[in-house]
Each structure stands twice: as structure tokens, then as C-alpha cells.
């Protein structure tokens, strides 16, 4: 913590601007109204303050805001944003993509995945469901992000909203993620004619029941190696020779060179031999 | 071994409705596809409906479109036809299948459905 | 939807024979071609899937080619129990079709 100390009358802050760069941390934290640094905060970000400043303007507004700061102040937090903890986020209401895409630029380029992930949480709670807007902010601000959200989160995004949603953005999607985001896509998706239908589909898969998969070998979908790596294990081991062969056309020969590699590996070795050998790719079970 | 037996079959004027059962064993039912397909008298084989795994998918060719429900309750092991506005045409020896990714692999001995007047 | 036409419709052959039966896609359909074997009153049975495989317990008489379009059901050495009717069938395309079948009959 910084030590209390008085004030010079000469050092005497009456607005925030350049001069404070000249400030001791002594100094800031003794003349610098917390009060005045809240109805100012827009122009923190133009000042280049150092790190150790910072730490200084930021313990003030923990104090004067010890249950979380308003919207007001988050909006511009420049580069004040670095300095916030996961912990320090998790007490904000936020409300304005505005605020959201403010913070996500200033984030860029240092690894605050823990505190823009809470960010974003906190964005979700804020707005009620995760909307298109927010996902479109999402998917041009922070490619990825959307899979920083828990299951919970990402159950509140209506299908409607999927369509914004670009392979890219689920690349770092984990399993219970995509769990609740296919059965979106597949509803957002179901009027599509067949091929359409798969190339939408596709990046969602990794949550695809097993009923689903063997229905998509009725589509000629053809489905790449990379997809069927990605669905989960659990759908992929009940699938017969027939239906893996139906659904990956002519990349079957692919699985030969996964075949150690999971599912694959547990698929093969759930099979009949005399099945696996009518794919005439020499797997062994 | 793989045993798939058709009942329900039977005379019915046209217009009017039937419903097929076919009692499956020997295999785990609720991992495969099922189908129907039939047979008018004399002549070749043609594919009616097929319904995925969990029942949540069904296929049917136009021909039977609107008319024909395939359904299933895999806690019985039973595949179901039910048969609406049939049609002298509907006239058939009706066969459940196992459906295997893209063929046939396990036939039911048939159930005759007659429809006429 | 695919046309699958088969020829001849029907063929006179002696035990011994070598049969060929042959079938058609109206549009290219792969390797998805099965072949199923009907008795008089009885069900149909898998013969062969995926153009060439011989499915669990059928004789090795029994062989498949082809690809694209145009596919063959060969019987190198028929047997008494040969003789029925054969279907062939796309797998490649919802609604799967059959063709109108081969009757092999006894010369």
C-alpha cells in the first residue's frame, strides 16, 4: 500500500492531466481525489503514465469503489485495464459493447485471456443472454473469446445468433462448450439444403451426438479427416465400418493415417476385424 | 443372431390405415437404423422409410410421403409402420431391415398387406 | 431420384455356368452398389456391399465390380442354390433404389 502522506498546496490537483506524470507515487496517492479521478477518468488514457502510477490511480478507485467500479469509469479505463485482476472484474456489472470493445483494444497483444474471459462472463451477465450484437463484438474484436465462456454462458446465446458465429471462433471451443452450442447450431441450421447444411454445421460437430453423425452419412457429406478428429469419442465409438465409410466418402483412406490416434485408435478397436478389413485400408483392431 | 419378425399385415380397404410391428433381437437394437421396405406382388424391391437410431430422424421416398410414419420404441425392440390413405398401388409384402450405412444387411420374413375393396 | 436398370432380366443357365448379371446408375453413385438375393417366399439377403464385398457367410463364388455407373454381379460356378432373383441397389443417394431384379432360372 502506498503511505499517507499530506499534500504540498502547490501539488494540489484540480484536474487530471499531464502534469500528473511528474508526480511521486507518494504525491499522486496524497493529492489526487479519487472523487475527481472517477469524473475524469476519460482522459487517463492520453496521460503516459507508468506502471507504478497506475497501481497508484487504481488503489484509489478500489477505495472509493470498493464494490466494484460503475460502468462509467470502466469505459475508460485505458490502460488502466491491464492493472485489473480476474477478481477485480468479477464485482463489475457491464452492460455497453461499447465498454466491452473499449477494453478488449486495450488488452490486445498481453496475455489477459483469465481477466478478458471474466470480462466477457461479466458482458453476458450484464446484457441477460449472449446476443448477437455482443457475439458479432465478440467475433471482430476477439476471435476465440466466445470459447472463454463457460457452458452456462454459451447456453444463454439463442440460435438465432449462431449464424454470426465463424469456424474461427470455436477453435478453442472444449467439448462441454460445443455440447451446448451444436443442438443451437443444429436448430439454427435445419432448413438448409444438405450441403450447406454440412459446411455450417461442420465446426460445431465436436458436440454432435452419435444419432447425429450416423444421419449426416446419409447427406454425402464427405467430411474431412481434421472434423472427424474433432468429434467426441463417446459419438464416434458406436458408429459401424458402413456408417464411418458412408460419412467420410473418399477420405476413409485418412484413417489409416490416424489410426493411432484418438478416436480413431478406440474406434478401430471396437470393430470387428472382418469388418475393418472391408475397407481394405489394413487397420488392425 | 440377427432375427427381425413383421406382424400387423393384413386386408384393408383403401383408404383406410394399418399398422406394421416388426420385434427385433439378436443385436443392440437402439445403435442401428431401421427401414421398411416392400414388395408388390410379382414385382421388385422398393424402400418405404427408415428412421435413425434414436428416432429422431426419418427418411421416406415421395411415394409414401404424408401417408407412411415410421416410429420405433427402443425399450421394446420394436419397429413400427403406421399406414395412412392407402392405396390399391400400397399392395405389398412389407419387410423390416436392418440398415447398415448404405445397404440392407438383416431381412424380416415379411408381413402381406392387401388393400382393396 | 437414381434409375438402377439391371440386364438381362432374366437368364437361362445350367449348374456350372458362369453367370454375369450387370446394373445401372442413371447418375455416378461410387462404390455404394449392394447386391441381394431373393428366393420364391422368402426375404431378400445381403449378397454384397460397396461394389465388391462379400458380406458374412456368402460363398466366394459370388463376386462384384465396377464403380461410377456401371457395376457386375458375377457367379463363377453356379450352384443349385443359385437360383433366385437378384436385386441391385444404390446406397449412394437418398431415396435408395433398387433395380427391377435378374431372375437366374434353370436351363
Known amino acids: 500500500d502506498v503511505e499517507r502522506t499530506t499534500c504540498p498546496p502547490e501539488k494540489e490537483v484540480h484536474e487530471i492531466d499531464e502534469n500528473l506524470i511528474f508526480y511521486k507515487k507518494r504525491e499522486l496517492e496524497a493529492c489526487v481525489d479519487a472523487a475527481l479521478l472517477a469524473a475524469q477518468m476519460d482522459r487517463v488514457d492520453a496521460i503516459p503514465f507508468t506502471y507504478e502510477q497506475l497501481d497508484v490511480l487504481k488503489h484509489k478507485l478500489d477505495e472509493l469503489y470498493p464494490q466494484g467500479y460503475p460502468e462509467s469509469v470502466i469505459r475508460h479505463l485505458g490502460h488502466l485495464f491491464l492493472k485489473m485482476s480476474p477478481e477485480d472484474i468479477r464485482k463489475w456489472n457491464v452492460t455497453s459493447l461499447e465498454t466491452l470493445k473499449a477494453l478488449l483494444k486495450v488488452s490486445k497483444g498481453h496475455e489477459m485471456s483469465a481477466q478478458v474471459a471474466t470480462l466477457i462472463d461479466r458482458v453476458v451477465v450484464g446484457r441477460g443472454q449472449l446476443d448477437k450484437d455482443t457475439v458479432d463484438t465478440l467475433t471482430a474484436f476477439c476471435p476465440g473469446c466466445l470459447c472463454s465462456l463457460s457452458p452456462e454462458r454459451l447456453s444463454s446465446v439463442p440460435p438465432s445468433v449462431i449464424g454470426a458465429v465463424r469456424p474461427q471462433d470455436l477453435d478453442t471451443c472444449g467439448p462441454r462448450q460445443l455440447d451446448v452450442l451444436y443442438p443451437k447450431a443444429r436448430l439454427a441450421f435445419q432448413n438448409m439444403s444438405g450441403s450447406e447444411y454440412f459446411v455450417k454445421i461442420r465446426p460445431f460437430l465436436g458436440g454432435a451426438p452419435t444419432e447425429d453423425l450416423k444421419a449426416l452419412s446419409q447427406q454425402n457429406v464427405s467430411m474431412d479427416l481434421a472434423t472427424f478428429m474433432k468429434l467426441r469419442r463417446e459419438a464416434v465409438l458406436p458408429l459401424t465400418v458402413a456408417e464411418v465409410q458412408k460419412l467420410l466418402g473418399p477420405h476413409v483412406e485418412g484413417l489409416k493415417v490416424e489410426e493411432q490416434h484418438s478416436p480413431v485408435r478406440d474406434w478401430i478397436l471396437k470393430q470387428r476385424q472382418d469388418d475393418l478389413d472391408t475397407l481394405g485400408l489394413g487397420l488392425q483392431g | 443372431e440377427v432375427q427381425l419378425v413383421e406382424s400387423g399385415g393384413g386386408l384393408v380397404q383403401p383408404g383406410g390405415s394399418l399398422r406394421l410391428s416388426c420385434a427385433a433381437s439378436?443385436?443392440?437394437?437402439?445403435?442401428?437404423?431401421m427401414s421398411w421396405v416392400r414388395q408388390a406382388p410379382g414385382k421388385g424391391l422398393e424402400w418405404v422409410a427408415t428412421i435413425s437410431n434414436g428416432g429422431t430422424y426419418t427418411y421416406y421416398p415421395d411415394s409414401v410421403k404424408g401417408r407412411f410414419t415410421i416410429s420405433r420404441d427402443n425399450s421394446k425392440n420394436t419397429l413400427y409402420l403406421q399406414m395412412n390413405s392407402l392405396r390399391a398401388e400400397d399392395t405389398a409384402v412389407y419387410y423390416c431391415?436392418?440398415?447398415?450405412?448404405?445397404?440392407?444387411?438383416?431381412w424380416g420374413q415379411g408381413t402381406l398387406v392387401t388393400v382393396s375393396s | 431420384d437414381i434409375q438402377m436398370t439391371q440386364s438381362p432380366s432374366s437368364l437361362s443357365a445350367s449348374v456350372g455356368d458362369r453367370v454375369t448379371i450387370t446394373c445401372r446408375a442413371s447418375q455416378d453413385i461410387s462404390n455404394y452398389l449392394n447386391w441381394y438375393q431373393q428366393k420364391p417366399g422368402k426375404a431378400p439377403k445381403l449378397l454384397i456391399y460397396?461394389?465388391?464385398r462379400l458380406h458374412s457367410g456368402v460363398p466366394s463364388r459370388f463376386s462384384g465390380s465396377g464403380s461410377g455407373t456401371d457395376f457386375t454381379l458375377t457367379i463363377s460356378s453356379l450352384q443349385p442354390e443359385d437360383f433366385a432373383t437378384y436385386y441391385c441397389?444404390?446406397?449412394?443417394?437418398?431415396?435408395?433404389?433398387f433395380g427391377q431384379g435378374t431372375k437366374v432360372e434353370i436351363k
Open positions: 431391415a436392418r440398415f447398415d450405412g448404405y445397404y440392407f444387411d438383416y
Open positions: 441397389q444404390q446406397g449412394n443417394t437418398l431415396p435408395y433404389t
Open positions: 439378436g443385436f443392440t437394437f437402439s445403435d442401428y437404423f
Open positions: 460397396y461394389t465388391s
